[in-house]
Interface confidence: low
């Protein structure tokens, strides 16, 4: 999906009002310095691409983020503010429903959500220009 035409300010508002708090809740009990940020993004469409990938694509050691509160709110924000996004996600969501068995919060998931926090923060504040 090409995130270029999303309403970035509306997505940012959704992040600030709820998604950020849900991410913090998920990470509660974890030190903010426990994980190093290894994933980054250069602009807002790129950030959303990385956010979508980390949130909804199962990875080795962490297959259970898609049903978390922050993930559902992320999906809702993208569906509302990114034209045509919903249609691209129907098949992927159905496949995920069949695969998902139980919710397990692993250290790998915590690390992945830590990466997500960094990506969201970068999305929320595009980089200063290098002078």
């Amino acid at each position: 999906y090409d995130f270029t035409n999303c309403d970035f300010e509306k997505i940012k508002a959704a992040y600030l009002s709820t998604i950020s708090k849900d991410l913090i809740t998920y990470m509660s009990g974890t030190k903010s310095t426990e994980f190093n940020n290894t994933v980054s993004c250069s602009n807002r469409p790129h950030c959303l691409t990385e956010i979508q990938s980390l949130t909804f694509n199962p990875t080795a050691g962490c297959a259970s983020l898609a049903k978390e509160m922050f993930a559902m709110k992320t999906k809702a924000a993208l569906a509302i503010w990114c034209p045509g996004y919903s249609e691209t996600q129907i098949n992927a969501t159905q496949a995920m429903k069949k695969r998902r068995k139980r919710k397990v919060t692993t250290n790998k998931c915590l690390e992945q959500v830590s990466q997500l926090q960094g990506l969201w923060r970068r999305f929320n504040r595009p980089l200063l220009k290098q002078q």
Epitope: T33, S40, R125, L127, Q130, Q131
Partner: antibody, heavy 121, light 105 residues
Amino acid sequence: EVQLVQSGAEVKKPGASVKVSCKASGYTFTDDYMNWVRQAPGQRLEWMGIISPYNGGTSYNQKFKGRVTLTVDKSASTAYMELSSLRSEDTAVYYCAREDYDYDGYAMDHWGQGTTVTVSS
Amino acid sequence: EIVLTQSPATLSLSPGERATLSCRASSSVSYMHWYQQKPGQAPRLLIYATSNLASGIPARFSGSGSGTDFTLTISRLEPEDFAVYYCQQWSSNRTFGGGTKVEIK
């Protein structure tokens, strides 16, 4: 716990340069911006500039442009502010202040203890 | 550059009284932050984005306003509240107001 620890007081002669350091701990250094703010005796707070530790991008107050240079050492989680061509009016307390952009409106939520720079001949 | 004007410059009140501090911007701003500074100390964030209490700040502090006019209110002054208060706006340049000193009457 977020902490910003600044270098010690400096006494400089007019025309010289000063470099103040700000060592960050308790958070991921590259996740937030670092501001530099100064306060001359009895005066208001004056914003000097801001740097992104993530990529070294900077934005400066036009008043200081050309005289102030902000840099970071990511490996040491340390930000630096260098002010050149010092004059007596630069005598002030210099603060680093983290700007957390999880705050709507981007507030400076943690400050260093301040570094006193005295410019005197 | 957006200029912030704070009034009054000095506010003389007694503990238990209500303090109302004003900050006026030379042009419209989205948000206003408020900081407290005590002698010999660094500023401390009190209110962010006009009306949100920063972490660890007691509920007697509140902020309001929009556009060019913003207010910091301390509902009942405690002895530790006597200090200088600065407003600050975020735009391409950050700027601070001149400060309001809240002193014991």
